[in-house]
């Protein structure tokens, strides 16, 4: 069955947008006007995972690209990466765990917790133009809250 997906953009709680930084990295920065066209459009797919009444498992692919955000250990540290996949097989309902994020809505803000590494979240830095990363702390300096903007297909 085709997996249910929607197209969207994400901004962190400081209103920074996410853009590509090289072929396999995202960075967060403030954009205005025509520059807003640079922000990445995600294809958010609803997938199987350890769903709860508060957490919805999703996979975050880059629209019309065979790239997905995934969480892996690098040098013993949970790390966010963009991973290339075979477009014939993705997205799928039963995504591998490294591709799955628990979408958590709190006070109209979204958090994306790694299914592979509980309590690690998609994060941005306070500073401009820094990479999007997987962070192990909430409520500190780094930003783990996002808003989602729907994009028509």
């Amino acid at each position: 069955a085709p997996v249910r997906s929607l197209n969207c953009t994400l901004r962190d709680s400081q209103q920074k947008s996410l853009v590509m930084s090289g072929p396999y990295e995202l960075k967060a920065l403030h954009l205005q006007g025509q520059d807003m066209e640079q922000q990445v459009v995600f294809s958010m797919s609803f997938v199987q995972g350890e769903e709860s009444n508060d957490k919805i498992p999703v996979a975050l692919g880059l629209k019309e690209k065979n790239l997905y955000l995934s969480c892996v250990l690098k040098d013993d540290k949970p790390t966010l990466q963009l991973e290339s996949v075979d477009p014939k097989n993705y997205p799928k309902k039963k995504m591998e765990k490294r591709f799955v994020f628990n979408k958590i809505e709190i006070n109209n803000k979204l958090e994306f917790e790694s299914a592979q590494f509980p309590n690690w979240y998609i994060s941005t830095s306070q500073a401009e133009n820094m990479p999007v990363f997987l962070g192990g702390t909430k409520g500190g300096q780094d930003i783990t809250d996002f808003t989602m903007q729907f994009v028509s297909s």
């Epitope: 995972g49 709860s52 765990k97």
Partner: antibody, heavy 122, light 107 residues
Framework: EVQLQESGPGLVKPSETLSLTCTVS????????VSWIRQPPGKGLEWLGL???????YYNSPLKSRLTISKDNSKSQVSLKLSSVTAADTAVYYC????????????????WGQGTLVTVSS | DIQMTQSPSSLSASVGDRVTITCQAS??????LNWYQQKPGKAPKLLIS???TLRPGVPSRFSGSGSGTDFTFTISSLQPEDFATYYC?????????FGQGTKLEIK
Amino acid sequence: EVQLQESGPGLVKPSETLSLTCTVSGFSLSEYGVSWIRQPPGKGLEWLGLIWGGGDTYYNSPLKSRLTISKDNSKSQVSLKLSSVTAADTAVYYCAKQTNVWGYDLYGMDYWGQGTLVTVSS
Amino acid sequence: DIQMTQSPSSLSASVGDRVTITCQASQDIDDDLNWYQQKPGKAPKLLISLANTLRPGVPSRFSGSGSGTDFTFTISSLQPEDFATYYCLQSSWLPLTFGQGTKLEIK
């Protein structure tokens, strides 16, 4: 060998809270989810909800406001509490282990307890 | 929620008969369909997972097929111990939902 055993009072008064315990062996509650299912006398099976290995819970909508599932990993016990019960909650209550195989069979239920009958009556 | 429509609700058959039960999902569930056998006073027992995978120790006279929305459960040659109630369960999305059950009785 995987085993699950439900226990609790067989009789509960209307408007009170039904409390059951599922004691498991042969697997770790920190690794596998456990579901609760019920079956009214002579009727079919109704899935109530589950608790995952990490402790998150999913409750089926019709019972969401009355149902609480919790666990104690160290005691290998999962508990179910259903508040404000009525005669319609009279059923055999089962707990069951989730298969929990990511990317293959995450949501299936492979092993069940023998069930415990709870009657709601004054 | 996904609705599971199971038929027939009851069935009379004789030892040695071939018996078929069907389950229809209200939306595509791929192969995420389990079949359970329940005898009176006992817990359901998983016979088949993922539409057609026979569980260890389950006799080969039991089989399952189908994908998407339409599924079939077959007992190729009924044995006396097979008279029971059978349920399908979709394990594709939460909440999990069961079919209404099929009571298999001796003719």
